[in-house]
């Protein structure tokens, strides 16, 4: 019989009949090693490859370029998949991005983008987005006109300041922009008035730090 093709992403996993959310191994084009990822098979039809997750503040997101490049954390909890992997996955075919958010009052919201991919390392993993919809604000809290990725040791933003140092975490900062899902985790009661928190401006404003976030991608033709 024909040899089974390895899974390129969680959409392949889902279409192979695995419809339970959990950790799966995927084989990304041009990457030497397979990668363990969390697959969300419940939200909006399933098939989502989780590239970022925050939930309890157990993981330090104030890291340098190399760590954001290769990823950190564990797909069973808080993690960043890694820019090199995000670049490789989104180079395979066209992807959409969905971001799930929850505030400390238990309100949930999402932002979805019809097109999502990032540039390679030489392009500072520049963000490319199109077609914003969702409940987390009428306007996009991710920079639509393109922003380079910055970390505490790689200042690629459009500010006279150093956004990643000041606001903590690695992100597609502008000057510094209306979002930072990799900021400091603040617990309930401590999450107001924070410059460097987990921010999604058009959901909860400029200085409210969110409780949980999930960034996930799925092929456009799923």
């Amino acid at each position: 019989r024909e040899e089974e093709k390895p899974f390129r992403d969680c959409a392949d996993v889902y279409q192979a009949g695995f419809n339970k959310s959990g950790i799966y191994t995927i084989y990304i084009n041009n990457m030497p090693e397979p990668k363990k990822v969390f697959c969300n098979m419940d939200v909006n039809g399933g098939g989502w490859t989780v590239i970022q997750h925050r939930e309890d503040g157990s993981l330090d997101f104030q890291r340098g370029w190399k760590e954001y490049k290769m990823g950190f954390g564990n797909p069973s909890g808080e993690y960043w998949l890694g820019n090199e992997f995000i670049f490789a996955i989104t180079s395979q075919r066209q992807y959409m991005l969905r971001i799930e958010l929850m505030d400390w009052e238990g309100n949930r919201a999402y932002s979805q983008y019809d097109r999502f991919h990032i540039g390679n390392e030489k392009q500072n993993y520049r963000l490319y987005l199109k077609g914003h919809t969702g409940t987390a604000g009428k306007q996009s809290s991710l920079i639509l006109h393109g922003a380079d990725f910055s970390t505490k040791d790689a200042d690629n933003d459009n500010c006279m300041c150093k956004c990643a140092l000041m606001l903590t975490g690695g992100w597609w900062f502008d000057a510094c922009g209306p979002s930072n899902l990799n900021g400091m985790f603040y617990t309930a009661g401590q999450n107001h008035g924070k410059l460097n928190g987990i921010k999604w401006h058009y959901f909860k404003g400029p200085s409210y730090s969110l409780r949980s976030t999930t960034m996930m991608i799925r092929p456009l033709d799923f």
Epitope: M160, C161, M166, A175, C176, P178, G193, L195, H201, P206
Partner: antibody, heavy 122, light 112 residues
Framework: EVQLVQSGGGVVQPGRSLRLSCAAS????????MHWVRQAPGKGLEWVSY????????YYADSVKGRFTISRDNAKNSLYLQMNSLRAEDTAVYYC???????????????WGQGTLVTVSS | DIVMTQSPLSLPVTPGEPASISCRSS???????????LDWYLQKPGQSPQLLIY???NRASGVPDRFSGSGSGTDFTLKISRVEAEDVGVYYC?????????FGQGTKLEIK
């Protein structure tokens, strides 16, 4: 390149009005809070007024409250200061200034206009 | 309003020598979010002010590394490790922790 180009200064009699303008370019104007700061001849800097990125939040210094009105037109990338009931003590160079950070996170003035002199004299 | 007091008000310096300006506030500038909203600006003769230091100790892009800011709460310092001729002008500290924003009186740095 970020630019703030000011216009509208001049000599005016006490009690009269004047409108200052600040044309912005080189950045997404609608994302930034904007300020007016003034400097009387030979004196230090004094904050005058602030308007948030959307125009929904406005503050004034006590010395100009009720007489000055700050406004913005995001479609035209422009900031304004309408000055009514002018007094001799309002004589100063007026600067428009942009917040360092966008989306109403205020950490000071990242960019300044070139300044425009307002002289209130009879 | 918060009163910002700078010293000295006049600072004659020999090129190559260090310089230090103090700024004291009438109330603590340490915000509940952990930041000191204290900036330093330089106004060169005939020019608009320019940002040097933000949030107490962060150098703005393009500012030479001979400039440094330090301090927390009510006491802040701007240091220039080696003064150059182009550093002449009036230096202002400004607080933004408490509304309204207020400036110090300014320190005039001149070359001896």
């Amino acid at each position: 390149e970020v630019q703030l180009v000011q216009s509208g200064g001049g000599v005016v009699q006490p009690g009269r009005s004047l409108r200052l303008s600040c044309a912005a370019s080189g950045f997404t104007f609608s994302s930034y809070g904007m300020h007016w700061v003034r400097q009387a001849p030979g004196k230090g800097l004094e904050w005058v007024s602030y308007i948030s990125s959307s125009g929904s939040t406005i503050y004034y210094a006590d010395s100009v409250k009720g007489r000055f009105t700050i406004s913005r037109d995001n479609a035209k990338n422009s900031l304004y200061l309408q000055m009514n009931s002018l007094r001799a003590e309002d004589t100063a160079v007026y600067y428009c200034a942009r917040d360092l950070l966008d989306y109403d996170i205020w950490t000071g003035y990242g960019y300044w206009g070139q300044g425009t002199l307002v002289t209130v004299s009879s | 309003d918060i009163v910002m007091t700078q010293s000295p008000l006049s600072l004659p310096v020999t090129p190559g020598e260090p310089a230090s300006i103090s700024c004291r506030s009438s109330q603590s500038l340490l915000h509940s979010n952990g930041y000191n909203f204290l900036d330093w600006y330089l106004q060169k003769p005939g020019q608009s002010p320019q940002l040097l230091i933000y949030l107490g100790s962060n150098r703005a892009s393009g500012v030479p590394d001979r400039f440094s800011g330090s301090g927390s709460g009510t006491d802040f310092t701007l240091k220039i490790s080696r003064v150059e001729a182009e550093d002449v002008g009036v230096y202002y500290c400004m607080q933004g922790t408490h509304w309204p924003p207020t400036f110090g009186q300014g320190t005039k740095l001149e070359i001896k």
